[in-house]
Interface confidence: low
């Protein structure tokens, strides 16, 4: 399937609008600090060049690879050295090293200001004045802050963003119409970005075998009526799509994702009865819908797994003949029977099964050795079940904010070396598992909770890799993808940690506290809580609760005072002194 001109091929397949959007996303994800206007200029130049290649595939440079064309374009940026420092050295390299170099410099935590949402009327005016620029700005701002965002999915978010403004800027109460939609897009976007980051980490850090195993388990849960060969085909195609997007090959990724959606819709009968409503939708919506589709009903007549995987005398023979295929079939069979298990649990079970076969197939009596293998699964299953039960009970007892605080204390004690902003961000997100999953029926709780926690803990791993400070975090993040969450759960108070010296400045607050939003106030308080635990890691729950209650009372008192700043200046030192005494 070779083409004389790759850029012409992708332009024709994707169409001008998607081509331009994807190139803008690609450039913004690579050069995260460049101004919007610079990127738009580069994208326009690439698009004009692509059009000349569509007209004549033999024209000069049209035979160059996309990496060569895009890399050459990025390396024309005048301020590369001043803005990006050593990233400019990438431009001295040849492909494919140059693209690898750009990928290496993607920054998961770029030093960019938080996006401020203007007044609704201002946004609607900007939307009406120049809709195209307005939407490009959205793609640019999201892509540069989320350098691994799943590019074809970002086009879908942009389409929804456009639809929200088109509808709400006509409404009588623009704000009431628009703001909830923008909040929903923001929250969904953050979740989508984090989920994709885990996929890329899985591919980049653990190889495509790890990603394929994840995909077999998840697709088998979704499509329990599909044959193993069908699931395997979907897994192969999906792996290609995500490998491309994680590598920055966004045009190929979007094109292959569209092909996968087409294939699924043409083969619904052999995949799932749930695809029908997705397949009637336009491309971007269709692909999103297929990715999010609910699990199909399980076939009624599935036999016991034990016959083929425990009782059969051919287990070792079948395993030896094609290990990965045999294990893949085991994972498929187990997953399609267990939509109530998390993907990570299913992968742990497959790993345990593999370890047992490795040991037993070399034993004198293999069958006797592996006869009880399913019994060994019980503790692996019970551990996440108990964890979800305990944490949902705690969430229901405390509510989200206090549940987050409990997790903040728990995780700060486990890994106190991690930076305070990272501990606050990660613990707040871990705490959101309660509202997201605990309200679900029992059969959906574990897959919701544990697979969500895997996504959040991957964020911790990604941030920690940039600035490693804790051997325990490195160990949990790198030793086993499927055991990351149990590894973090098993961490205890770090006895080797030398407590942080008390710094009164950390606990000095001003009247600006009073004008913060509720969320911002929570973050301030939670930041103080982390610092307290870093100062006194052995403080009891009661001691910490007492200090936090005093803190809340002190802030509330001063925010009600006539002279707020004077109150903070006077009451602040008293609060600090009382806190030190309480924790002594």
């Amino acid at each position: 399937d070779t083409h004389k001109s790759e850029v012409a091929h992708r332009f024709k397949d994707l169409g001008e609008e998607h081509f331009k959007g994807l190139v803008l996303v690609a450039f913004s994800q690579y050069l995260q600090q460049c101004p919007f206007e610079e990127h738009v200029k580069l994208v326009n130049e690439v698009t004009e060049f692509a059009k000349t290649c569509v007209a004549d595939e033999s024209a000069e440079n049209c035979d160059k690879s996309l990496h060569t064309l895009f890399g050459d374009k990025l390396c024309t940026v005048a301020t590369l050295r001043e803005t990006y420092g050593e990233m400019a050295d990438c431009c001295a390299k040849q492909e494919p090293e140059r693209n690898e170099c750009f990928l290496q410099h993607k920054d998961d935590n770029p030093n960019l200001p938080p996006l401020v949402r203007p007044e609704v009327d201002v946004m609607c005016t900007a939307f009406h004045d120049n809709e195209a620029t307005f939407l490009k700005k959205y793609l640019y701002e999201v892509a540069r802050r989320h350098p691994y965002f799943y590019a074809p999915e970002l086009l879908f978010f942009a389409a929804r963003y456009k639809a929200a403004f088109a509808e709400c800027c006509q409404a009588a109460d623009k704000a009431a119409c628009l703001l909830p939609k923008l909040d929903e897009l923001r929250d969904e976007g953050k979740a989508s970005s984090a989920k994709q980051r885990l996929k890329c980490a899985s591919l980049q850090k653990f190889g495509d075998r790890a990603f394929k195993a994840w995909a077999v388990a998840r697709l088998s849960q979704k499509f329990p009526k599909a044959e193993f060969a069908e699931v395997s085909k979907l897994v192969t195609d999906l792996t290609k799509v995500h490998t491309e997007c994680c590598h920055g090959d966004l045009l190929e990724c979007a094109d292959d994702r569209a092909d996968l959606a087409k294939y699924m819709c043409e083969n619904q009968d052999s995949i799932s009865s749930k695809l029908k409503e997705c397949c009637d939708k336009p491309l971007l919506e269709k692909s999103h819908c297929l990715a999010e589709v609910e699990n199909d009903e399980m076939p009624a007549d599935l036999p016991s797994l034990a016959a083929d995987y425990v009782e059969s005398k051919d287990v070792c023979k079948n395993y030896a003949e094609a290990k990965d295929v045999f294990l893949g079939m085991f994972l498929y069979e187990y997953a399609r029977r267990h939509p109530d298990y998390s993907v990570m649990l299913l992968l742990r079970l497959a790993k345990a099964y593999e370890a047992t076969l490795e040991k037993c197939c070399a034993a004198a009596d293999p069958h006797e050795c592996y006869a009880k293998v399913f019994d060994e699964f019980q503790p692996l299953v019970e551990e996440p079940q108990n964890l979800v039960k305990q944490n949902c009970e705690l969430f229901e007892q405390l509510g989200e904010y206090k549940f987050q605080n409990a997790l903040l204390v728990r995780y700060t004690k486990k890994v106190p070396q991690v930076s305070t902003p990272t501990l606050v961000e990660v613990s707040r997100n871990l705490g959101k598992v309660g509202a997201k999953c605990c309200k679900l029926p029992e059969a959906k709780r574990m897959p919701c909770a544990e697979d969500y926690l895997s996504v959040v803990l991957n964020r911790l791993c990604v941030l920690h890799e940039k600035t490693p400070v804790s051997e325990k975090v490195t160990k949990c993040c790198t030793e086993s993808l499927v055991n990351r969450r149990p590894c973090f759960s098993a961490l205890e108070l770090d006895e080797a940690y030398v407590p942080k010296a008390f710094n009164a400045e950390t606990f000095t607050f001003h009247a600006d506290m009073c004008t913060l939003s509720e969320k911002e106030k929570q973050v301030k308080k939670q930041t103080a809580l982390v610092e307290l635990v870093k100062h006194k890691p052995k403080a009891t729950k009661e001691q910490l609760k007492g200090v936090m209650d005093n803190f809340a009372a002190f802030v509330e008192k001063c925010c009600k005072a006539d002279d707020k700043e004077a109150c903070f200046a006077e009451e602040g030192p008293k609060f600090v002194a009382a806190s030190q005494a309480a924790l002594a």
Epitope: P96, E100, F206, G207, D208, A210, H247, T478
Partner: nanobody, 116 residues
Framework: QVQLVESGGGVVQPGGSLRLSCAAS????????MSWVRQAPGKGLEWVSS????????YYADSVKGRFTISRDNSKNTLYLQMNSLRAEDTAVYYC?????????SGQGTQVTVSS
């Protein structure tokens, strides 16, 4: 096109040393953790060692700990395995692979034979 080409294998006496190399191309080498795995005659794949993308973190199977050293040179897109104090049980085809423990090889491998 992803390519991994292993080299440096050979026949060596017990207690001897070898240095294996793996030349990588066609993918973002410096963005990926890498591993060495081996397959002894008639056995399954066995993980040997892994290194993170920056080269700062290394991991070893118990059977090779203290004898083998994994390293990488991102400027040359090359992964290395220094093998000292070799034993008969180290005889195998050695493969490099993209990813951490559990990564699957795609190259031809290089044969290491430890024999007196």
């Amino acid at each position: 096109q992803v390519q991994l080409v292993e080299s440096g294998g050979g026949v060596v006496q017990p207690g001897g040393s070898l240095r294996l190399s793996c030349a990588a191309s066609g993918f973002a080498f410096r963005g990926f953790g890498m591993s060495w795995v081996r397959q002894a005659p008639g056995k399954g794949l066995e993980w040997v060692s892994s290194i993170n993308n920056g080269g700062s973190d290394t991991y070893y199977a118990d059977s090779v700990k203290g004898r083998f050293t994994i390293s990488r040179d991102n400027s040359k897109n090359t992964l290395y395995l220094q093998m000292n104090s070799l034993r008969a049980e180290d005889t195998a085809v050695y493969y490099c692979a993209i990813g951490g423990p559990g990564a699957s090889p795609s190259g031809q491998g290089t044969q290491v034979t430890v024999s007196s």
